[in-house]
């Protein structure tokens, strides 16, 4: 059963100090979004018992395994049904607590009734404040039965429920007609799914014989032990003030478990802690009684004394529940009540026994649930005990259940049942998830859903390059953290698989399904530098750059040019998609702007180091284009250009710039200045014969203006090869301005 306890503090008469606490001893309980366990829930259930609405109750989480409900403002807030839900998956369990008002008209003689299928249940409501009116019994909020007030027997109204079946389970209440529901007596009826001492789907299996008031669970045959007892059969008492399946929890406060009601998973229900009784769990057990609700009687023999928490305390030389067994009778010592092994393992189980005559190897045997008897392979004999070691054959799931160690000597015999849980190692149902990747590393989330049993103790990540036959690399990681696979090859596919393990030998599960994860490209390492740049217009900039010479192929797909306009806080990015390019024309820039310029190599999505930045000032926007540009060949080396001045000039032209380029040529164009702005014609000399040229021009005031239309003209034939074009204006010959 799930280790889940709901505690109600009944000692506090002030409702504002009242609290309910739900404590889980389950591994990973209450961790909420954690993949290994949903959260603990603690709430009031108003579906059956409606009370006047009040301020909302406050829920406080104390670590991962405890949740407390507070904020009760008046006694009526306490009346009704509370539930705590804990455990994961198929083990998710609801524990229910029913609170009765101490001042109610009717009070339950006993709140929780656990009965077997087919039994007769009798609910008894004791008259606390009499009303001469009918008593209404309800089941789960619906009308169930009516009693005339004269039908009270010995100050009690009884509801007999013959031949109960599991659907009869639920919350029952007895209420005087036309009275407040807060004055009702509330009961909880739990009907086990089987007859007494039986469990399992067809109720074919025999219960282990739960001791000290433990109740056999009808689904799994486990004993749900009362608070203060532990062990497969609840045979062992906890120290005073402790509870939980392994006695791992401690009652709060100085008076231990006094005034606390403990509610455990069905079919146990609720009771006082061990050593206490009464409707408020504040009365110590009467002499001779012990256990939860003081329901057990000691009946100690041979000088044993009764302890109200643990039962008989035996004098030297005697043992047994009632001190009825002499120490001469052999006795199994310190046998764990529950052992856990992994499927297909071959564990060694030890069983120690003492007695007089002394037990020998052959006198100790181990019996499996199917009745198979194992004999020990070796025995260690010590002065006070013999320890037999059993080599268990490969475990299968059917080996889960109650095993028994038995010792027999001429002095008698003893046996001890213990539970063996055969667990299935966890197997991932899904592949791990890629979170981020770089050229030499992958960041992976190993958390996946799994089949089999938890808890997960380790997660192994196996990986190797795709289609490789080399050994897998393995990394062991924390279950709850992401993993970084390092020192990988760039631009390489890796097959990655998860392997989960649970505690214990053989706890490693099979590998999960593979997934392909690919590393990124290698980072480009070369740093370009800017060779130069020149302004081709008020909004155009031609940039050139170089790369260092290194052996081997160039690692890069292209270049990224960045222009930063600090005034406006804007960045312009230009992608040059050829790694061979060393020049680029940037257009659409803002005239009169100061830019910071750099260039960097890129590869896939990765950027290399940026070049040292350059600072470029674009001139302000210039004048309109010259009009009606016309070209006329004069000879085999001369062409005359004529034009008209631009219209609507913002100021006096300082010069004209002529661009000359051989038609269809691949080289850069040549720029020639015409420094006499009043001229409207010029002769370009030094051209090659029989060659077709393209011309365009623009004016400059403070900055260069727009280009004119482009004109074509061919020089005349049969000339010699010229040295290169020069220009001559009508007034005087000028040198070439490059």
């Amino acid at each position: 059963a799930v280790d889940l306890t709901l505690l109600a503090n009944l000692r506090l008469t002030d409702p504002q100090r009242f609290f309910l606490t739900c404590v889980s001893g389950e591994a990973g309980a209450g961790r909420g979004s954690d993949a290994w366990g949903p959260p603990l829930l603690l709430e009031k259930d108003d579906r059956i018992v409606r009370t006047p609405p009040g301020p909302p109750l406050r829920l406080a989480r104390n670590g991962s395994h405890q949740v407390t409900l507070r904020g009760f403002s008046k006694p009526s807030d306490l009346v009704g049904v509370f539930s705590c839900v804990g455990g994961a998956g198929a083990r998710r369990t609801r524990v229910i607590y029913v609170h009765n008002s101490p001042g109610a008209h009717l009070l339950p003689d006993k709140v929780t009734h656990t009965v077997n299928k087919g039994d007769t249940a009798v609910l008894s409501a004791r008259v606390h404040k009499e009303k001469q009116t009918d008593v209404i019994w309800k089941s789960n909020g619906s009308y169930f039965y009516t009693l005339d007030w004269h039908e009270a027997q010995d100050g009690r109204f009884l509801l007999q429920l013959p031949n109960v079946q599991p659907p009869s389970s639920g919350i029952y209440s007895a209420t005087y007609l036309e009275a407040s529901p807060l004055g009702s007596a509330f009961f909880r009826l739990i009907v086990r799914g089987c007859g007494a001492g039986r469990w399992g789907p067809g109720c074919t299996k025999e219960c282990p014989g739960c001791l000290h008031g433990g109740v056999c669970h009808d689904h799994d045959g486990e004993c749900v032990c009362p608070p203060g007892f532990t062990g497969t059969r609840c045979e062992q008492a906890c120290r005073e003030g402790r509870f939980g399946q392994s006695c791992q929890e401690q009652c709060p406060g100085i008076s231990g478990c006094r005034g606390l009601t403990f509610c455990l998973p069905d079919p146990y229900g609720c009771s006082c802690g061990s050593g206490w009784r009464g409707s408020q769990c504040q009365e110590a057990c009467a002499p001779g009684h012990f256990g939860a609700d003081c329901r057990l009687q000691c009946q100690c023999q041979n000088g044993g004394t009764c302890d109200r928490f643990s039962g008989c305390v035996c004098p030297s030389g005697w043992h047994g529940v009632h001190c009825e067994k002499s120490d001469r009778i052999p006795q199994i010592l310190n046998m764990a009540s529950e052992l856990e092994f992994n499927l297909e393992t071959m564990p060694r189980i030890n069983c120690a026994a003492a007695g007089n005559p002394f037990p020998v190897r052959g006198s100790i045997e181990l019996r499996k649930p199917d009745g198979t008897v194992l004999l020990s392979t070796k025995a260690i004999v010590e002065p006070e005990k013999t320890t037999a070691e059993f080599e268990v054959p490969r475990l299968v799931l059917a080996d889960s259940g109650f095993w028994e160690c038995r010792v027999s000597t001429s002095g008698g015999q003893d046996s001890r049942r213990f539970k063996v849980n055969v667990k299935v190692p966890p197997v991932p149902l899904a592949a791990p998830r890629l979170l981020t990747k770089q050229s030499r590393q992958l960041v992976v989330s190993p958390l996946v859903s799994f089949s089999g049993d938890g808890p997960i103790s380790t997660v192994r990540l196996h990986y190797r390059p795709q289609d490789s036959t080399m050994d897998w690399s393995t990394i062991v990681v924390d279950p709850s953290e992401n993993v970084t696979l390092m020192n990988l090859r760039p631009k390489t596919g890796y097959s990655v698989r998860v392997q989960l393990s649970r505690p214990g030998e053989g706890g490693e599960g099979a590998w999960g399904p593979p997934t392909l994860m690919t590393t990124d490209c290698p980072e480009p390492l070369l740093q370009p530098w800017l060779e130069g740049w020149h302004v081709e217009g008020t909004d155009r900039l031609r940039v050139s750059w170089s790369l260092p010479l290194v052996p081997g192929p160039l690692v890069g797909d292209g270049f990224l040019l960045r222009l930063w306009d600090g005034t406006r806080g804007q960045e312009r990015r230009e992608n040059v998609s050829s790694p061979q390019a060393r020049t680029a024309l940037l257009t659409g820039l803002t005239p009169g702007t100061h830019y910071q310029l750099d260039v960097q190599l890129y590869h896939c999505t990765l950027l290399g180091p940026a070049s040292p930045p350059a600072h470029v000032l674009l001139p302000p926007s210039g004048p309109p284009a010259p009009r009606h540009l016309h070209a006329q060949a004069l000879s085999d080396s001369e062409i005359q250009l004529t034009w008209k001045h631009p219209e609507a000039l913002p100021g006096p032209i300082s010069k004209y710039v002529v661009e000359v380029q051989v038609a269809g040529g691949a080289g850069d164009p040549l720029w020639i200045d015409v420094d006499r702005p009043e001229e409207t014609s010029t002769i370009i000399r030094g051209l090659n014969a029989s060659t077709r040229y393209l011309f365009r021009m623009r004016a400059s005031i403070q900055g260069l203006g727009d280009w004119s239309n482009t004109v074509e003209e061919s020089t005349l034939g049969n000339g010699l090869q010229a040295e290169g074009p020069v220009q001559e204006s009508r007034a005087a010959e000028e040198g070439l301005d490059q």
Epitope: Q132, T133, I136, Y145, T146, D148, H150, E151, L177, E178
Partner: antibody, heavy 123, light 107 residues
Framework: EVQLLESGGGLVQPGGSLRLSCAAS????????MLWVRQAPGKGLEWVSV????????YYADSVKGRFTISRDNSKNTLYLQMNSLRAEDTAVYYC????????????????WGKGTTVTVSS | QSVLTQPPSVSVAPGQTATITCGGN??????VHWYQQKPGQAPVFVYD??DRPSGIPERFSGSNSGNTATMTISRVEAGDEADYYC???????????FGSGTKVTVL
Amino acid sequence: EVQLLESGGGLVQPGGSLRLSCAASGFTFSKYKMLWVRQAPGKGLEWVSVIYPSGGYTYYADSVKGRFTISRDNSKNTLYLQMNSLRAEDTAVYYCARVVVPAFYYYYYMDVWGKGTTVTVSS
Amino acid sequence: QSVLTQPPSVSVAPGQTATITCGGNNIGTKSVHWYQQKPGQAPVFVYDDNDRPSGIPERFSGSNSGNTATMTISRVEAGDEADYYCQVWDPTGDQYVFGSGTKVTVL
């Protein structure tokens, strides 16, 4: 479907006797309080008698006390009203009804009624 | 034993509101139930001062305090024409006391 069906009514002379039956179906009869209500021609409703689920406790209106007896047979899901020493003023339509308590509340009301059977006391 | 007094008749035009009263000593301390009976039919439980059974229109409402309980039928329809009885339970001798009945006529 929850149903109540009365029978046994008829014409009877003053001083005579009559036994009414009410057959219940569609619910667990043994859990419910049952009662008889009558309605004289042109008059209002008048409660006659009630019986508890166990059958152990019964109550009567003053007008019929000592003359009428209510009883039930839970194994047959049937309610009875034995009427002796009948008088002219007992002439009425007799209804049987189921007494129930709603969820969340604690009061009685009659949620299911039969169609009624007519008793005429006349010489 | 309780005595419950109702007006013999109430007339109301369609779409208007009909109010039926039920007087009784300290009736406000009891649960009052209302039954509707159409000619030739058995009574039907329609309302009490806590609740309305499923299938009964929201037009039926009520209140109860002091010495008078009231049932109100708003937006009266022709189908609401019937006799209406109030009823209380008296624990003394397990008495089920009905009012004298009120005939509601829809004009």
